[in-house]
């Protein structure tokens, strides 16, 4: 294991990717720790402002967490010769607020990418596809981890954050081979309609700890390989028949629904019936009514149709302000 001491270079990395000399096979960038045996480079919590240019060619696992990268430009990891072995790239918690188109180009083996805990005010639609073609070359990515990438309110662009993330996921149909997608803790109010249709290979989808109120316009139908669907800690009130039928039709799926504020009124009847017979939902006997008040804390599985009523809607003449 070689380790570059911080005394060897305290200046930020400024050399451009294109002009960089080919790195020596066993070279380790300043402020990083390298293990050729483990094919791993760790440049962690070093306040780096740019991706090191002199990464060793053997690198398979690259940790660039806890830095101050701010912007990931096009070709941020492009090298001559390319980093052909790089398979896992972790950029979490590095204060990225902008990921530009083509940021991950020229990484032919990149299977896992973690951008979690970066306040991404701008995520290019071509961040993962690398080009603006309607159909791009397939990305090698198999796992994409985007937990807690929502920027603070004052840094948000005018367009919806959900839409920005969705555009990057569907661009060029590049992520058709993606197996795992984590989008937890992003304040999502909705899931854009066409996203899942473009990710047919998904096996694991984590949408937990968002603010999803409804899945009415989301289709899971073509996710035939889906094994785990995490919807815990959202704001779901009820699942309607269309969603229930789609979930039931997925051959391998397990669905996690804990910590949603279920509204146990007449609209809940179909979901209760489904819950009683499905094996899809994990920990289904923990699901508990939050509203209305008279139903609070009741177990959904123990409800029957007589319990599930809706207050009659008064005609306008009887309504009071």
């Amino acid at each position: 294991t070689s380790s570059a001491s911080s005394s060897s270079s305290s200046a930020p990395f400024l050399a451009s990717a294109a002009s960089a000399q080919p790195p020596l096979p066993d070279q380790c960038p300043a402020l990083c720790e390298c293990s050729e045996a483990a094919r791993t480079v760790k440049c962690v919590n070093r306040n780096l402002t740019e991706v090191p240019t002199d990464l060793p060619l053997y690198v398979r696992n690259l940790f660039l967490t806890g830095n101050q990268l701010a912007v990931l430009p096009a070709g941020a990891f492009a090298r001559r010769p390319p980093l052909a072995e790089l398979a896992a790239l972790n950029l979490s918690g590095s204060r990225l607020d902008e990921v530009r188109g083509g940021a991950f180009e020229h990484l032919p083996s990149l299977r896992q990418l973690d951008l979690s805990h970066n306040p991404l005010a701008y995520l290019s639609p071509f961040a993962f596809s690398g080009s603006n073609a309607s159909i791009s070359a397939p990305s090698p990515l198999v796992e994409l981890i985007l937990n807690h990438i929502v920027p603070p309110d004052d840094k948000r662009q005018n367009r919806s954050f959900e839409g920005m993330v969705a555009a990057a996921l569907v661009a060029g149909r590049a992520l058709q081979g993606l197996h795992l997608l984590e989008l937890a803790s992003n304040h999502f109010l909705y899931l854009p309609r066409d996203v899942l249709a473009q990710l047919p290979s998904l096996r694991y989808l984590d949408l937990s700890n968002n603010s999803l109120v409804s899945l009415t316009y989301v289709s899971f139908r073509n996710l035939t390989h889906l094994e785990s669907l995490h919807l815990e800690d959202n704001a779901l009130k009820v699942l309607h028949n269309g969603t229930l039928a789609e979930l039931q039709g997925l051959p391998h799926v397990r669905v996690f629904l804990d910590n949603n504020p279920w509204v146990c009124d007449c609209h809940m009847a179909d979901m209760v019936t489904w819950l009683k017979q499905t094996g899809v939902v994990q920990g289904k006997d923990r699901l508990t009514c939050a509203f209305p008040e008279k139903m609070r804390n009741r177990v959904l599985l123990e409800l029957n149709s007589a319990d599930l009523d809706c207050d009659p809607i008064l005609p306008p003449s009887l309504q009071t302000s």
């Epitope: 815990e232 910590n259 009741r298």
Partner: antibody
Framework: QVQLQQPGTELVKPGASVKLSCKAS????????MHWVKQRPEQGLEWIGN????????NYNEKFKNKATLTVDKSSSTAYMQLSSLTFEDSAVYYC?????????WGQGTTLTVSS | QVVLTQSPAIMSASPGEKVTMTCSAS?????MHWYQQRSGTSPKRWIY???KLTSGVPARFSGSGSGTSYSLTISSMEAEDAATYYC??????????FGGGTKLEIR
């Protein structure tokens, strides 16, 4: 009015076991999870575990996994907690509480004293 | 696992005084509940879902907060409010966690 009735006191010797009871009335017993909470003298509240009276499913605080066993008798709408291998540290007030998102009704608590 | 920290641990207030106690979560939570426990009695749910008062709780009590910071306020302290108050995480799955409590005494 929902009620959870617990015996007032239990006195047991170190090393022994005890089975605390909590009898529920005036609601559908199987429709709500039942929780157990420990409170040592002048201390805070500590969640022990819970049980679904409908199917007997349980969850435990890791700390109490080898100490507490939760059961129910649906016919009498009674929840039980057995505490084993008692030590002086187990001396406390034990509450049952009906709950889901929160604990909306509590028993009066059973004061367990472990003394030789 | 989320840790709840209440402050202050002990406080005293004169009748008519405004009282505020806080509950800080180690990570963001959606809602918080509060329980009142008078000396020698079992706890009672006092405030739920951050700001809703349980039936029978006097209107001088209020709850507020979001994210990692929550508070319980008494607009005008009365003798019967002397008790220990516990916050509890909004959850329907284990584990259920309580704060360490704030003991409120009458001055």
């Amino acid at each position: 009015q929902v009620q959870l009735q617990q015996p007032g006191t239990e006195l047991v010797k170190p090393g022994a076991s005890v089975k605390l009871s909590c009898k529920a009335s005036d609601y559908t017993f199987t429709s709500y999870w039942m929780h157990w909470v420990k409170q040592r003298p002048e201390q805070g509240l500590e969640w022990i575990g819970n049980i679904n009276p409908s199917n007997g499913n349980t969850n435990y605080n890791e700390k109490f996994k080898n100490k507490a066993t939760l059961t129910v008798d649906k016919s009498s709408s009674t929840a039980y907690m057995q505490l084993s291998s008692l030590t002086f540290e187990d001396s406390a007030v034990y509450y049952c509480a009906r709950g889901g998102w929160d604990f909306d009704y509590w028993g009066q608590g059973t004061t367990l004293t472990v003394s030789s | 696992q989320v840790v709840l920290t209440q402050s202050p641990a002990i406080m005293s207030a004169s009748p008519g005084e405004k009282v505020t106690m806080t509950c800080s979560a180690s990570s963001s939570v959606r809602y918080m509940h509060w329980y009142q426990q008078r000396s020698g009695t079992s706890p009672k749910r006092w405030i739920y879902d951050t700001s809703k008062l349980t039936s029978g709780v006097p209107a001088r009590f209020s709850g507020s907060g979001s994210g990692t910071s929550y508070s319980l306020t008494i607009s005008s302290m009365e003798a019967e409010d002397a008790a220990t108050y516990y916050c509890q995480l909004w959850t329907s799955k284990p584990p259920w966690t309580f704060g360490g409590g704030t003991k409120l005494e009458i001055r």
